[in-house]
């Protein structure tokens, strides 16, 4: 099933992202990039020794799978 445009309410984005399902929206340059090939380590479980990464999106601005979703570290990436 094709996913419709995904919306972003952070970082001054005026409109839904035009990305197709296989793409991710890169907030630094504000355009879609292929993300299906990226190796994304799983987020550390709660209680891990180092603090969980705090994303710059506020909870009410969460995107993707839903509010409270952990950020996935992508070493280097894109």
């Amino acid at each position: 099933m094709r996913r419709g445009p995904r919306s972003l309410r952070g970082r001054d984005a005026p409109a839904p992202t035009p990305c197709v399902p296989a793409e991710c929206f890169d907030l630094l340059v504000r355009h879609c990039v292929a993300c299906g090939l990226l190796r994304t380590p799983r987020p550390k479980p709660a209680g891990a020794s180092s603090p969980a990464p705090r994303t710059a999106l506020q909870p009410q601005e969460s995107v993707g799978a839903g509010a409270g979703e952990a950020a996935l570290p992508l070493p280097g990436l894109l």
Epitope: R6, L8, G10, R11, T17, C19, E23, C24, F25, D26, L27, L28, V29, R30, V33, A34, C35, L37, L38, R39, T40, P53, R54, T55, A56, L57, S62, V63, G64, A65, E69, A71, L72, P73, L74, P75, G76, L77, L78
Partner: antibody
């Protein structure tokens, strides 16, 4: 060990060219975005350029646009900076660095540079 | 271009002191602010990302706070190895920009 080892610096005359290299090891280079950053003697850090993991996108700082080219060879795990029409003000220590990002849902968030090379000195002088 | 202004440009402190460095952005950058430490002749080292997240391996005496335009790096108890220059950097938009640094010297 995650490492970036740089080479290619030196003394060059104004108007000439130079190519810097940055050899990566200890991580999946082909999945990593990369930057060049420079620091003139006694000055602030200045971002030079960034390249996507697959080379599909490149962005440059205004001061080098049209003169410098960032590129990469993923088969050799190496990043390059081709510097043409060099000027006195390009004299600096040049660093390569890995782009640090996180994926939240379908959005890629940028958090700076988490691995740096040792730096290589470029001196532009007649 | 987003301009980052750091203050002070230098400071003198003693081992054990609490040190605070500020970084102000010329426009709102949400929490896309990172802090680096650089020692003479060495490459910068990432300390804090996303304004307040401690990079792996960095001692917990380092902390960051702020959002929007005003940010702070705090060293709770200065150690001998902390004497260095500290830079802020925004990753909100290209061109990426850095502050001009705060040099922490021994009093």
């Amino acid at each position: 060990e995650v490492q970036l080892v740089q080479s290619g610096g030196g003394v060059v005359q104004p108007g000439r060219s130079l190519r810097l290299s940055c050899a990566a090891s200890g991580f999946t280079f082909s999945s990593s975005g990369m930057h060049w950053v420079r620091q003139a003697p006694g000055k602030c850090l200045e971002w030079v350029a960034v390249i996507w993991y697959d080379g599909s996108n490149k962005y440059y700082g205004d001061s080098v646009k049209g003169r410098f080219t960032i590129s990469r060879d993923n088969s050799k795990n190496t990043l390059y900076l081709q510097m043409n029409s060099l000027r006195d003000e390009d004299t600096a220590v040049y660093y390569c660095a890995r782009r640090f990002t996180m994926l939240r849902g379908w959005y890629i968030e940028d958090y700076g540079m988490d691995v740096w090379g040792q730096g290589t000195t470029v001196t532009v002088s007649s | 271009e987003i301009v980052l202004t750091q203050s002070p440009s230098s400071l003198s402190a003693s081992v054990g002191d609490r040190v605070t460095i500020t970084c102000r952005a010329s426009q709102s950058i949400s929490s896309y602010l990172n802090w680096y430490q650089q020692k003479p002749g060495k490459a910068p080292k990432l300390l804090i990302y996303a304004a307040s997240s401690l990079q792996s391996g960095v001692p917990s005496r380092f902390s960051g706070s702020g959002s929007g335009t005003d940010f702070t790096l705090t060293i709770s108890s200065l150690q001998p190895e902390d004497f260095a220059t500290y830079y802020c950097q925004q990753s909100y938009s290209t061109p990426l920009t850095f502050g001009c640094g705060t040099k922490v010297e021994i009093k």
